[in-house]
């Protein structure tokens, strides 16, 4: 794995303990709370993110419209259970034998249950909304700099190509962006928009994920692009399963 | 203005290195990754590869792994791409280009020519 | 890898008359309704010079001369009126995937 060799640290991920223990004394790191091995060229997957957050100490209408299956994380941080590559397992449950299924970002799409619930398979999210709202400005941002400069952050800070950002919308002050992968475009190699959406959303709350870097200074032409308000909705490829009850609360 | 400001010709024996840089300017270095391209009478114009000067580490064409070699100095905003063991087939124009919106090649260096002649 | 074919090679018009330059991918280059396709203009001696970005988006400071359209497979590049300083010849290049490739080329002359 690619690590800074010279001080043995993760670029990318700052939750981590390296040290030159790799084969031939190259820099190797592992996730706090999993103690994974991660790749430090690229994201780590969400799914280690969160453990090693649950482990650590503890301090005209152009925009679009959720879908009425667009999930959003309204649960919060929880330890989430991983798999051997780091992804979510699809039942996660808590100490206290309390059960549910989660979508490839972790976000429950059922409801909860006990330990014989079961979830067949990891539902795979194809389609993140990142709604932002930004600070009062002088003006609108003009849509194409928007745009672009949207698009170039993903493509070289998240390393997201850029034919997974399907749109940036604006209707001042709201910002949304649009990513899309569905399973048969994703490559090896490719990073996932569930990756790159959360990275995003702990760089615009100012808690970056990277190691040693400054945090994100957002400049459309040079006017700073100030975030006061995320909101992420989730699509799966399969709608989420739950009960009336949820639906009509 | 952005300007990429590269290395000066080079006349090289066959079997030998060259390293050609590729300065930028007027724009946030790291900001953008940068593409190398070889343009031959040949082949008209390939690509070999991009190097993300945020990370640091670079994406090569197939074709010409083993063969180039690309590296970035942040401290001095510049990339540079090192060609091994040269032959003949390898002379040609080398470029560097920005890596711009949609993957497109938005600013390009002036080019740095390499002639493998014995 | 993906294979860009240009057509023509070579390509006279009048001046003042329109010159349109194709190019056809050997597989969509289309991604959500983007189309990762550009075009650039090359003069001897310089560099490629970008001149449309995904199939259709004027780059900044070239000409409304220039237009380009196209998706999935078919892309155009579109010059009208042809002027003296368009004696240039000009490569279409897809982003979709890796490697990046470009067309062969097409070279525009004046008749």
């Known amino acids: 794995h690619t690590a800074a060799q010279d001080n043995c640290t993760c670029p990318t991920n700052k939750m981590t303990v390296c040290s030159p223990d790799g084969p031939g004394g190259r820099c190797q790191c592992r996730a706090l709370g999993s103690g994974m091995a991660v790749d430090c060229s690229t994201l780590t997957s969400k799914c280690l993110l969160l453990k090693a957050r649950m482990s650590a100490p503890k301090n005209a209408r152009t925009l679009v419209r959720p879908s009425e299956h667009a999930l959003v994380d309204n649960d919060g941080l929880y330890d989430p259970d991983c798999d051997p590559e780091g992804r979510f397992k699809a039942r996660q449950c808590n100490q206290t034998s309390v059960c549910w299924c989660v979508n490839s970002v972790g976000v429950r799409r059922t409801d909860k249950g006990d330990l014989s619930l079961r979830c067949d398979e990891l539902v795979r999210t194809h389609h993140i909304l990142i709604d932002l709202r930004h600070r009062p400005t002088a003006g609108a941002f003009n849509h194409s700099d928007l745009d672009a400069e949207l698009r170039r952050l993903f493509r070289e800070r998240y390393r997201l190509h850029p034919k997974f950002v399907a749109a940036v919308h604006y209707e001042q002050p709201t910002i949304q962006i649009e990513l899309r992968q569905n399973t048969s475009q994703k490559a090896a190699g490719d990073v996932d928009i569930g990756d790159a959406a959360y990275y995003f959303e702990r760089d615009i709350k100012g808690e970056s994920l990277f190691q040693g870097r400054g945090g994100l200074d957002l400049r459309v032409r040079g006017e700073p692009l100030q975030v006061e308000r995320t909101l992420i909705y989730y699509l799966d490829e399969i709608p989420p399963k739950f009960s009336m009850k949820r639906l009509t609360a | 203005q952005v300007q990429l400001q590269q290395s000066g010709a080079e006349l090289v024996r066959p079997g030998v290195s060259v390293k050609i840089s590729c300065k930028g300017s007027?724009?946030?270095?790291?900001?953008?990754?940068m593409n190398w391209v070889k343009q031959s009478h040949a082949k008209s114009l390939e690509w070999i590869g991009v190097?993300?000067?945020?990370?640091?580490?670079?994406n090569y064409n197939q074709k010409f792994k083993g063969k180039a070699t690309m590296t970035v100095d942040k401290s001095s905003s510049t990339a540079y791409m090192e060609l091994a063991r040269l032959t003949s087939e390898d002379s040609a124009i080398y470029y560097c280009?920005?890596?711009?919106?949609?993957?497109?090649?938005?600013?390009w260096g002036q080019g740095t020519s390499v002639t493998v002649s014995s | 890898d993906i294979v860009l074919t240009q057509s023509p090679v070579f390509l006279a018009v009048s001046l003042g008359q329109r010159a349109t330059i194709s190019c056809r991918a050997s597989?969509?280059?289309?991604?959500?309704?983007?189309?990762?396709m550009h075009w650039y203009q090359q003069k001897p001696g310089q560099p490629p010079k970008l001149l449309i970005y995904?199939?259709?988006n004027l780059e900044s400071g070239i000409p409304a001369r220039f237009s380009g359209s196209g998706s999935r497979t078919d892309f155009t590049l579109t010059i009208n009126p042809v002027e003296a300083d368009d004696v240039e010849t000009y490569y279409c290049?897809?982003?979709?995937?890796?490697?990046?490739?470009f067309g062969g080329g097409t070279k525009l002359e004046i008749e």
């Open positions: 597989e969509s280059v289309d991604s959500y309704g983007n189309s990762f």
């Open positions: 007027g724009y946030t270095f790291t900001d953008y990754g």
């Open positions: 190097i993300s000067t945020f990370y640091g580490d670079a």
């Open positions: 280009a920005r890596r711009g919106n949609y993957d497109s090649m938005d600013y």
């Open positions: 995904r199939a259709s």
């Open positions: 290049q897809q982003s979709y995937e890796d490697p990046p490739t």
